[in-house]
């Protein structure tokens, strides 16, 4: 059985989660990648995905989530900006490879967002001040609806706060670094 571990990120409202998930260059460079949230006892829910085929470095934005796929370095960068307490929860990066089930890229991310604006939105607690000039635009990304039943065989630990956003609208904000650890079947 695969042991799924978590990396914990504690950030304040308004900060950005800026996560890097790396993958096997030759195998997955142009594959479609996705960012998912895992709620207790439920199948992972896709919040945003790259285009298909995935474009090199071209940002795809869905609400407050921004995905950038750097093909040459086998790197998916996930950012969730302007974090809210409700964004707290468990997340993961996956690669879509139909008809096979999605391939998880790394340790799941346990995001804990607390109240108390830090005054320095940006990635991690060490972030520099950022300037938002233009309201984020939203790119509608077409993501496959299937998820892997394997990922819910064992319920993840109870999250400190569930992310409760309507299915029709994603309200996630700045997400900082997500660490990926390969999961082997």
């Amino acid at each position: 059985a695969t042991k799924l571990t978590e990396e914990k990120y504690e950030l304040k409202e308004g900060q950005t989660l800026d996560v890097k998930c790396d993958y096997t260059l030759e195998k997955f460079a142009s594959s479609q990648k996705a960012w998912q949230i895992i709620r207790d006892g439920e199948m992972p829910k896709t919040l945003a995905c790259t285009e298909r085929p995935s474009k090199n470095s071209h940002p795809v934005q869905v609400g407050r989530i921004i995905l950038e796929d750097y093909h040459d370095h086998g790197l998916l960068r996930v950012r969730m900006v302007n974090l809210q307490v409700e964004d707290s929860g468990l997340y993961q990066c996956v690669i879509y490879q139909p008809p096979k089930e999605p391939h998880m890229l790394f340790d799941r991310i346990r995001l804990v967002v607390t109240k108390g604006f830090s005054g320095t939105p940006g990635s991690n607690e060490n972030s520099t001040q950022n300037v938002y000039k233009i309201p984020p635009t939203t790119t509608k990304a077409l993501c496959p609806l299937y998820t892997s039943p394997r990922t819910v065989t064992q319920a993840p630990p109870k999250s400190t706060a569930d992310v409760s956003t309507p299915d029709s609208e994603i309200n996630l904000t700045n997400v900082t670094d997500i660490i990926r650890v390969p999961v082997f079947n």
Partner: antibody, heavy 117, light 107 residues
Framework: EVQLVESGGGLVQPGGSLRLSCAAS????????MSWVRQAPGKGLEWVAN????????YYVDSVKGRFTISRDNAKNSLFLQMNSLRAEDTAVYYC??????????WGQGTLVTVSS | DIQMTQSPSSVSASVGDRVTITCRAS??????LAWYQQKPGRAPKLLIY???RLQSGVPSRFSGSGSGTDFTLTISSLRPEDFATYYC?????????FGQGTKVEIK
Amino acid sequence: EVQLVESGGGLVQPGGSLRLSCAASGFTFSSYWMSWVRQAPGKGLEWVANIKQDGSEEYYVDSVKGRFTISRDNAKNSLFLQMNSLRAEDTAVYYCARDYGDSFDYWGQGTLVTVSS
Amino acid sequence: DIQMTQSPSSVSASVGDRVTITCRASQGIRKWLAWYQQKPGRAPKLLIYAASRLQSGVPSRFSGSGSGTDFTLTISSLRPEDFATYYCLQAHGFPWTFGQGTKVEIK
């Protein structure tokens, strides 16, 4: 071939201003974060500022906040650094660099900025 | 900010020698470390990214290892063109920060 060419450096008095430019070619400029990195004479490298693909976010190192402004013109494949209230400690070679998610993968040749009276 | 400490600050070596440079982060940066080579009057050149991945076009005598806080750049057999200053860069937390550099000199 990816190319980054900086210009606009020179000698300026303390308190003065200077605008650096970086002309990019050989890649889809509008798809990448871009940065300015500087190197004082005989010293190490220091990241100064970066800007998102569409210009909607900017980040700065603490020592230049409120004095420097990074901007870009995607239509002209150009990156800029407006430097105001210059100080002697800003004297350095300024490099334009492409952010590639986990590193700066391409750099320009640099342009020297000297702040002296 | 995350502080990066390189050692040694300089090293004298001969052609054919094996050279090892280390970089230590003030906090865990997972694998998000890059290595650069810089020659006098030139821009830095990316050698290694993600701690151990070789940038396209870089000779295989260069290799990187490590994760968390401790990282190493190794030049397996020094060539004349390898005499330069080497920098590490952490790309985990903003702002990205560089090590102070290691100068590889001719013995």
